[in-house]
Amino acid sequence: MAVTACQGLGFVVSLIGIAGIIAATCMDQWSTQDLYNNPVTAVFNYQGLWRSCVRESSGFTECRGYFTLLGLPAMLQAVRALMIVGIVLGAIGLLVSIFALKCIRIGSMEDSAKANMTLTSGIMFIVSGLCAIAGVSVFANMLVTNFWMSTANMYTGMGGMVQTVQTRYTFGAALFVGWVAGGLTLIGGVMMCIACRGLAPEETNYKAVSYHASGHSVAYKPGGFKASTGFGSNTKNKKIYDGGARTEDEVQSYPSKHDYV
C-alpha cells in the first residue's frame, strides 16, 4: 500500500514538475527589466528563451522572436538545450511511469518489470529535474554577470549634458517556476526510485525440495543462506549472460552510480 502511494505520489509530483518545466521554457519572463528605484515605467522590457517583449504603459505589448540561430549567445543556446532535454526526458519518463504504476494492470506484467520501469522513470525524472535546474541556474548566472557589468557601465554618456541609462535585467518569474519545477521533478524521481525498491520482491521463493537421506527427511530451501553467504538463486554471475540486464535483487539491493549511467 505504502509502495503504491509512494509511486503514485512520485508520478503526480513529477507530472506537476514537468508541466512546470514546460511552462518555464515557454514563458517570456526569464529576465525582466530591473526597475531599481522606479517601480512604474512607461516602457517595460522582458525576455524569454525564444523571444523578447516590450510592454508599454499604453497597454500595448510587442514581442519579437529570435529569428537567428547562429547569432544567439552560446549560453542561451545551452539553456534552451538543457530545458528541451529536460522536457523530452521527463515526457518519456512519464510515459514509462504510467505503465509502471502498480494500480494499472497491463496484461500479465510482472512486478519485477514494473519495478524496472519505475526505476527507469525515476532516473529519467531525476535527470530531467537536474537539466531544468542546471538550465535555469546557467541563465541566472548569466543575468547576474550581465547585471553587474551593466551596473558598472550604468551611466555611459556622462561627459556632457546627456545621460544614457543602460537597461539592466533581473530574474524573471520563469526562473523561479523553473527552479521549483525542476525540484519537484527531482523529488518525484527520487520517490519513484524509492517505490521501485518496494515493488521488487524481497527474494525469490521456490517450493521446498525434499531430499531423502538415511531414513529421515531434510527440507532444503535454496537461497536460504543468501544473506550470510552471498549465494542464492540470483547470483551475480547472471549478469554476464543476460546482456547487462539487472536482476531483481540488483535493482533492489545494489543501486550504485553505475546503475544510472
Epitope: Y46, E56, S58, G59, V162
Partner: antibody, heavy 118, light 113 residues
Framework: EVKLVESGGGLVKPGGSLKLSCAAS????????MSWVRQTPEKRLECVAT????????YYPDSVRGRFTISRDIAKNNLYLQMSSLRSEDTALYYC???????????WGQGTLVTVSS | DIVMTQSPSSLTVTAGEKVTMSCKSS????????????LTWYQQKPGQPPKLLIY???TRESGVPDRFTGSGSGIDFTLTISSVQAEDLAFYYC?????????FGAGTRLDLK
C-alpha cells in the same frame, strides 16, 4: 469610433477642489492607458496623470503629486481626475487622451477649462 | 525628468518649401528591448486638441500625409515637412514617451508668409 468627452471644469478658488470626468466610448476601456494632459495659457503641454493599460498603475509628475488623483470606473467607462489644493498655476485646458503604440496619444477629447482664481 | 528642447521656437515659411524642426532630449529615448525610439510628434491647430503625427520617432500615424517625416535616434530628432501646405500652419510638439513623466517640448510655431 473612439470618443472622449471631458466635463467638470470651471472656476475654483485657490486651495479648492474639482473633479474632472471623461466619458469614453468605442474601445475596451480597461485595456488602454489613459492620460490627463493640460495646456497652459502659454500653450505649454503637460501630462499631469497617467493610468496604464491592464494593470492600472498610476503616475504623476512632481508638480501635481499628492494633489491630483487619476482613477477609472470600468463599469461606467469613465476616467476621473480628482484635483485638490488647487493653485493659480493649475489654470489650464484639461484634455483626456487615450494612448496606444509607443505610448503616443492618438485620441484626444475637446478639453475642459479649469480656472483657479480668487 | 527628461527635458525636451525644441528649436526653433517659431518658423515662417512659404508654401511648397521644405521645413525641418528639431527636438533634443536630455536622455536617450532609445529602448534597447525593441530598438525603438520613444519620441512622438504632434500637430496642434488653433482651437483644436493636438493631433498625433509620428510615433516611435519615425512611424507615421495612419491618415497623416506622407510629406511629414520623422527621423533621428537617441537624443536628436527631426520632423521634416517636405512641401509645406497652407493647412500645416500650426504648433508642433515633440514628446518623450519613454520615461515618466511623459514630458513635452515647448513647441515650434509654424507660420506662413
Amino acid at each position: 469610433e473612439v470618443k472622449l468627452v471631458e466635463s467638470g471644469g470651471g472656476l475654483v478658488k485657490p486651495g479648492g477642489s474639482l473633479k474632472l470626468s471623461c466619458a469614453a466610448s468605442g474601445f475596451t476601456f480597461s485595456s488602454y492607458g489613459m492620460s490627463w494632459v493640460r495646456q497652459t495659457p502659454e500653450k505649454r503641454l503637460e501630462c499631469v496623470a497617467t493610468i496604464s493599460g491592464g494593470d492600472s498603475y498610476t503616475y504623476y509628475p512632481d508638480s501635481v503629486r499628492g494633489r491630483f488623483t487619476i482613477s477609472r470606473d470600468i463599469a461606467k467607462n469613465n476616467l476621473y481626475l480628482q484635483m485638490s489644493s488647487l493653485r493659480s498655476e493649475d489654470t489650464a485646458l484639461y484634455y483626456c487622451a487615450r494612448s496606444y503604440n509607443g505610448n503616443s496619444l492618438p485620441y484626444w477629447g475637446q478639453g475642459t477649462l479649469v480656472t483657479v482664481s480668487s | 525628468d527628461i527635458v525636451m528642447t525644441q528649436s526653433p521656437s517659431s518658423l515662417t515659411v512659404t508654401a511648397g518649401e521644405k521645413v525641418t524642426m528639431s527636438c533634443k532630449s536630455s536622455q536617450s529615448l532609445l529602448n534597447s528591448g525593441n530598438q525603438k525610439n520613444y519620441l512622438t510628434w504632434y500637430q496642434q491647430k488653433p482651437g483644436q486638441p493636438p493631433k498625433l503625427l509620428i510615433y516611435w520617432a519615425s512611424t507615421r500615424e495612419s491618415g497623416v500625409p506622407d510629406r511629414f517625416t520623422g527621423s533621428g535616434s537617441g537624443i536628436d530628432f527631426t520632423l521634416t515637412i517636405s512641401s509645406v501646405q497652407a493647412e500645416d500652419l500650426a504648433f508642433y510638439y515633440c514628446q518623450n514617451t519613454y520615461s515618466f513623466p511623459l514630458t513635452f517640448g515647448a513647441g515650434t510655431r509654424l507660420d506662413l508668409k
